[in-house]
Interface confidence: medium
Amino acid sequence: TEETIKFAAAHYNTEILKSIDNEWRKTQCMPREVCIDVGKEFGVATNTFFKPPCVSVYRCGGCCNSEGLQCMNTSTSYLSKTLFEITVPLSQGPKPVTISFANHTSCRCMSKLDVYRQVHSIIRR
Amino acid sequence: TEETIKFAAAHYNTEILKSIDNEWRKTQCMPREVCIDVGKEFGVATNTFFKPPCVSVYRCGGCCNSEGLQCMNTSTSYLSKTLFEITVPLSQGPKPVTISFANHTSCRCMSKLDVYRQVHSIIRR
């Protein structure tokens, strides 16, 4: 289908092509600022809450050209963030805790097979 | 839990408290730029593809203070975007189509009951 778009381009308004190009650019696979629910990220006990409940980090997101590709991180850094942890029933007031969050620093569209290999090589390590 | 936070501030470095505040700010419920998969958004036929497969629009996202609240749009505009539509098997080349996408312009943390009411009032209309 990539080939056919080359031919299609020849007959369409430059304005249309520019706006389509812009959409590709904005939706490409790259690190994007997202809100992560702290409790869900770490699977904490249901009686433990965090304030704020979410943190802002970068994770790979966006779209790949093809159905068989997936937007995956190729490098990761870790960010330490301090939050209040509240345990119910309240035996003590909220205590500040410092938690490390994965922050994706680069991304790539990878075939689902490569993703599978990458995940399994990490597990084997 | 809000009450208990009154006592949390005691004796903590201002820096810790300010960084926690900054996290609240960055993760608040607000319109955020997201990538929308066009096919999934409109539930199109499996033999229809779009190039680019995704578009960038604003949708409400982020976190609310409480479990019972949900980040919901309170106002919406519609953006027209031109994409190439490709139908398989290729009876013709990619054709440009203009599609309207919901773009959230303001958001609010609403109780799940309010969300239910809002959705149902829209359905009744």
Partner: antibody, heavy 122, light 107 residues
């Protein structure tokens, strides 16, 4: 333009209550810190407490803990100081002040209200 | 709580004089110190934040220095409008605390 305007001061009897308001404009109230500071006649500045309106936590000086409550209504961009069980020594001009933003290079009270006088006397 | 001790509590000076006010914290507060000027019947005004940074719109004759526990506010050449009371404040830990003030009077 950033502005803080206090209101609600006046004469009250010992043991009585009073609620002061601090109306804010010209900045993002929700993610600021709003402090209350008082000054007894002819004396220095005394920090009373603060609230982080968007986050919902507040903290108080020992001298007012349990008697004063700071709250905020983010829909009205207003902070409140509810003063109960007032004593003669609470007589002062009460100021609200904004703590400089997190993104700012340092923390200090960059904007203050004009102050409102609270007199506790029988 | 962190105590802030200011000295002197008052001083007399003439226009054009160099004036120095010191403030000592009861424990290390890094550079989280602010200085304010207050005139009778008015709200305080921020002069210096983070120990040494001049707040916008404040004349350059005002300067601040110090870190840890010892801090100084200096007015290089006193002007008629500078006669006022000056306060230091630590913003390192909650509760924030002020010094007791230094009154600068005309000699």
């Amino acid at each position: 333009e950033v502005q803080l305007v206090e209101s609600g001061g006046g004469l009250v009897q010992p043991g009585g209550s009073l609620r002061l308001s601090c109306a804010a404009s010209g900045f993002t109230f929700t993610y600021s810190w709003i402090h209350w500071v008082r000054q007894a006649p002819g004396k220095g500045l005394e920090w009373v407490g603060f609230i982080s309106p968007g986050v919902g936590y507040s903290y108080y000086a020992d001298s007012v803990k349990g008697r004063f409550t700071i709250s905020a209504d983010t829909s009205k961009n207003t902070a409140y100081l509810q003063m109960n069980s007032l004593r003669a020594e609470d007589t002062a001009v009460y100021y609200c002040a904004r703590d400089a933003d997190y993104d700012y290079a340092g923390w200090a009270f960059d904007y203050w209200g004009q102050g409102t006088l609270v007199t506790v006397s029988s | 709580d962190i105590q802030m001790t200011q000295s002197p509590s008052s001083l007399s000076a003439s226009v054009g004089d160099r004036v120095t006010i010191t403030c000592r914290a009861s424990q290390d507060v890094s550079t989280a110190v602010a200085w304010y000027q207050q005139k009778p019947g008015k709200a305080p005004k921020l002069l210096i934040y983070s120990a040494s940074f001049l707040y916008s719109g404040v004349p350059s004759r005002f300067s601040g220095s110090g870190s840890g526990t010892d801090f100084t506010l200096t007015i290089s050449s006193l002007q008629p409008e500078d006669f006022a009371t000056y306060y230091c404040q630590q913003t390192y830990r909650i509760p924030y605390t002020f010094g007791q003030g230094t009154k600068v009077e005309i000699k």
